[in-house]
């Protein structure tokens, strides 16, 4: 009968930081130079041997004289309680098929981690433990005095535990959160009655969970170095250097090379000139608690991220064309580059693609003259597109060309004894049509009654008007814009010898917030178009003069501009243009985009004061310069009488007082006789004009006292 192979020389050591027990033992009576498969059963008790908290089997092959090792991690800090360990064995080898039986247990080995030294009455464990967010942690206190009441707090909130023995209580903290990088505080307080006997605290370091690196990618710009980048995610560093930031290591499996990266989100890898084309990289993120890794497999030629092009230049630049040239960094022989050009100018963007070998060239056509363009280029590997290089760009300006459109010209003709005064206006050409900087305008005045006679006036830009004094002949006026290259087409206008149509009546119109809606009767005969001009009624025409060209088949238009101001009257004139370019005044209109109430009240004189009447007059009041069409006047009268005078009606003023009111509906009626008055009586009056928007400003009443019947004024 075989001897049971009992485990002997059991020694147990501890690692407080890891909260682990490390067992070492040997097996006696093992045949010399023989190997046996064996099973060891291990029992672990806590506080007392009868309190078994863990039983497990460990299978291994045992050699003669071999020292066996096995470790166990405790969820409870080892300082919290005494542990006991014992072991027994069983041969489980095919060489011994007969029934096997367990050996005797080894004797109990007591394990006590004494950190409860000194005169302190309370201890809390574990010390400075590092765990990952979301894990479960067990802590405990050891109290010397069982009479003490002990309360424990996590971040100031009381926690409740399970008593392991009269001196020890354990607390299971489930799924601990990350609170701060300098740790989570836990303390316990021992007290008797209301008196604190002492407090002990620990710091639990909770690390954020190490994330798998995201967006891991590698590329080369020169086939010498691979530049690898990734998003590291959350930094898991803790305070006091308890855990540094996670480290990153690159491992390439084909070459077996490894590199510890010095940056948290990128790493360079030297490409060896041994024609390795395929790379299999593993990026390993690591902190004290765990490792995370990601893999990429790629062909080097498929990961080319070119340096940006250089030496961007423009050749043969004229008004509408240019040749763009650039260079690329040569990285391999017979390499084909795909380049993309972007052209920005005049608020537009054009894109072109071109395939090149070493030097790039592209013909840019249909450009606008005298325009600044920004052209930029980027390139990529044409064979295996990975990504574009950065842009390289340069600005260039096309040359000027002659202006392409005639200026928009209009005029005001005023008749003076023996001549016409013609004020000529033109609008600056748009950038699109000026094709450069307009330097001057040529105004050619030709007398149509004396064809050989013409005058040239050269007017420097940026002037946009000129005054011509002409006799009573017909004139053709041409206006031409000039830049450094040449002249625009001419704008032609004809001034007739006949005076303008004076018979045209002025019509009042009402504007809206959107502007003025105008319509007119078509001009008899052939017209090439209509012109509507307008200006501020009260100002010098030259200051605010505008015009609009309207097509020949249109007899209405809306004049809308932000320049129209409330309370300002605008005068409009509508002209028909004959085929001979002679303008004929068709209609005149005047109005406000928005009427306002009058801005002032008339200065009123009291005339012919008698014992029974007086006359009010305001002849000097101008109805023209008002912020609305004056429709009439309101005359307010106050007296002691209960009844209002004939033609007056009762009214209530804004202050709530009562008075009598008379309405005059004719804006030109600027006098009123107030009669049927009593002698030696006190009256007050106030006169205010009104428009469609309301009355003038409120003002003080003027006092009048009628004389007695015998007085003569």
């Amino acid at each position: 009968e075989r001897l049971p192979l009992t485990p002997v020389s059991l020694k147990v050591s501890t690692n407080s930081t890891r909260q682990s027990l490390h067992l070492q033992w040997t097996v006696h009576n093992l045949p010399y130079h023989q190997e046996l498969k064996m099973v060891f059963q291990i029992q672990i008790s806590r506080i007392e041997t009868s309190n078994v908290i863990w039983v497990g089997n460990y299978s291994t092959t045992v050699k003669w004289n071999q020292v066996l090792h096995w470790s166990w991690e405790s969820e409870l800090p080892l300082e919290c309680a005494t542990h006991f360990v014992r072991i027994k064995s069983l041969v489980d080898d095919a060489k011994f098929p007969e029934p096997n039986f367990w050996s005797n247990w080894s004797s109990w080995e007591e394990v006590s981690v004494q950190d409860s030294t000194g005169q302190d009455i309370l201890f809390v464990f574990p010390k400075d433990k590092l765990v990952e967010e979301g894990t479960n942690v067990t802590i405990c206190y050891v109290s010397r005095n069982i009479q003490n009441n002990v309360s424990c707090y996590l971040e100031g909130k009381q926690i409740h535990g399970e008593q392991l023995d009269p001196h020890v209580t354990a607390f299971n903290l489930n799924s601990v959160p990350f609170i701060r990088n300098k740790g989570t505080n836990i303390y316990c307080e021992a007290s008797q009655g209301n008196v604190s006997e002492g407090m002990k605290g620990i710091v639990l370091f909770v690390s954020k969970v190490l994330e798998e690196p995201k967006d891991f990618s590698c590329e080369t710009e020169d086939f010498k170095t691979l530049h690898c980048t990734w998003d590291p995610g959350t930094d898991t560093a803790l305070g006091w250097s308890k855990q540094p930031s996670q480290s990153y290591t690159l491992f390439e499996s084909f070459s077996g090379e490894k590199k510890l990266c010095t940056h948290k989100n990128w790493c360079n890898w030297q490409i060896t000139q041994d024609s390795q084309e395929t790379y299999n990289f593993t990026l390993i993120a690591e902190n004290y608690l765990r490792k995370r890794s990601v893999n990429i497999l790629f062909n080097l030629t498929h990961r080319v991220y070119l340096m940006n092009p250089f030496s961007v230049n423009f050749e043969n630049v004229n008004a509408t064309n240019a040749i763009m040239t650039w260079k690329v960094h040569s990285i391999r022989n017979n390499f084909t580059y795909l380049c993309q050009i972007e052209l920005h100018g005049e608020g537009k963007m054009m894109q072109y693609n071109v395939s090149i070998k070493v030097n790039g060239e592209y013909f840019l056509s249909e450009l606008e003259p005298a325009t600044e363009y920004m052209a930029r280029v980027r390139c990529a590997d044409a064979s295996h597109f990975w990504k574009w290089s950065e842009w390289s760009g340069q600005n260039f300006t096309t040359l000027e060309a002659a202006p392409s459109e005639a200026p928009d010209v209009w005029r005001i003709v005023s008749l003076e004894p023996g001549n016409h005064t013609v004020t000529l206006f033109w609008k600056p050409l748009s950038k699109l049509h000026a094709n450069g900087k307009i330097l001057f305008y040529n105004v050619v005045v030709e007398n149509l009654d004396k064809p050989s006679s013409s005058e040239l006036h050269s007017i420097p830009a940026p002037a946009n008007s000129t005054k011509l004094i002409l006799d009573r002949c017909s004139y053709q006026i041409c206006v031409i814009a000039n830049n450094s290259v040449g002249a625009s087409p001419a704008s032609v206008i004809v001034i007739s010898a006949d005076p303008e149509n004076k018979e045209v009546e002025e019509e009042r119109i009402a504007g809206t917030e959107g502007g003025f809606s105008l319509s007119w009767k078509p001009q008899p005969g052939d017209v090439i178009g209509y012109v509507v001009d307008w200006c501020d009624h009260t100002q010098d025409v030259l200051g605010d003069f505008q015009w609009k060209n309207v097509g020949p088949n249109t007899t209405s238009t809306v004049i809308s501009t932000d320049a129209f101001r409330p309370g300002v009257r605008y005068d409009f004139r509508i002209y028909g243009l004959s085929t001979k370019r002679i303008a004929c005044l068709l209609e005149k209109k005047t109005g406000y985009s928005q009427e306002l109430a009058p801005s002032d009240n008339p200065h009123v004189l009291v005339d012919t004061l008698t014992s029974h009447s007086f006359t009010l007059s305001w002849k000097d009041y101008s109805t023209e310069s008002q912020p609305g069409f004056i429709q009439g006047y309101h005359v307010y009268l106050k007296s002691k009488a209960r009844q209002c005078h004939p033609r007056f009606e009762k009214a209530v003023l804004s202050d709530g007082s009562e008075c009598c009111k008379y309405k005059i509906d004719n804006p030109e009626e600027k006098a009123l006789i107030v009669d049927n008055l009593k002698p030696e009586s006190f009256y007050e009056f106030f006169i205010t004009p009104f428009t469609s928007a309301g009355e003038g400003p409120s003002a003080t009443f003027t006092k009048v006292t009628t004389p007695d019947e015998h007085s003569s004024m």
Partner: antibody, heavy 126, light 110 residues
């Protein structure tokens, strides 16, 4: 009984350094963290930093980094604070104060300061 | 300028109840415990309240503390003339990595 006794008043010139001591008695010196707090005349309290007498670990308020050093001599249960490059605004009463929790840690956590020294007046004047 | 905000002064008559507030932010009062100190004229500060509402032995139960969100308060009931002193709140600040104090409240017993 538990007490902290500080060194006497100091008068220093601008640019000089000052070293204040704080002797602990009545408890295990290495079991409790020491804080340093100062108070200018008529002003509030200002935390300067902390030291773990057991490990010697320290942490200073950002404002004083580079100018302050906290040390200890376990054999005589004494903590020290040294402040260099003194300026007139460093004129204050300097207190050492014990953290109320005996921490089983080499690191810092503030709970409350239950024992204070009597204070040391430091005057910085040219 | 103190990180924690306290009213500069407070007053009450003997027997009355007074409250002193202490306002902070999520990085200090909002996420850490608050303590209160009493400083009698010419003396070192004395701990009155720790962990928001707990009293060290020897502190009368007339003193009580509370915390809600990013604010804390100290209440003194049955005010006595010997309570005339400066009161300071304090907390750990996770952003500043240190202890921060309130500017102090001078309590006058009328």
């Amino acid at each position: 009984q538990v007490q902290l006794v500080q060194s006497g008043a100091e008068v220093k010139k601008p640019g000089a350094s000052v070293k204040v001591s704080c002797k602990a008695s009545g408890y295990t010196f290495t079991s409790y963290d020491i804080n340093w707090v100062r108070q200018a005349t008529g002003q509030g309290l200002e935390w300067m930093g902390w030291m773990n007498p057991n490990s010697g670990n320290t942490d200073y308020a950002q404002k004083f980094q580079g100018r302050v050093t906290m040390t200890r001599d376990i054999s005589i249960s004494t903590a020290y604070i040294e402040l260099s490059s003194l300026r007139s605004e460093d004129t204050a009463v300097y207190y050492c104060a014990r953290d109320m929790v005996a921490a089983n840690t080499d690191y810092y956590f503030y709970y409350g300061m239950d024992v204070w020294g009597q204070g040391t007046t430091v005057t910085v004047s040219s | 300028q103190s990180v924690l905000t306290q009213p500069p002064s407070a007053s009450g008559t003997p027997g009355q109840r007074v409250t002193i507030s202490c306002s902070g932010s999520s990085s200090n009062v909002g996420s850490n415990t608050v303590s209160w100190y009493q400083q009698l004229p010419g003396t070192a500060p004395k701990l009155l309240i720790y962990t928001n509402n707990r009293r060290p032995s020897g502190v009368p139960d007339r003193f009580s503390g509370s915390k809600s969100g990013t604010s804390a308060s100290l209440a003194i009931s049955g005010l006595q003339s010997e309570d005339e002193a400066d009161y300071f709140c304090a907390a750990l600040d996770d952003s500043l990595n240190g202890v921060v104090f309130g500017g102090g409240t001078k309590l006058t017993v009328l």
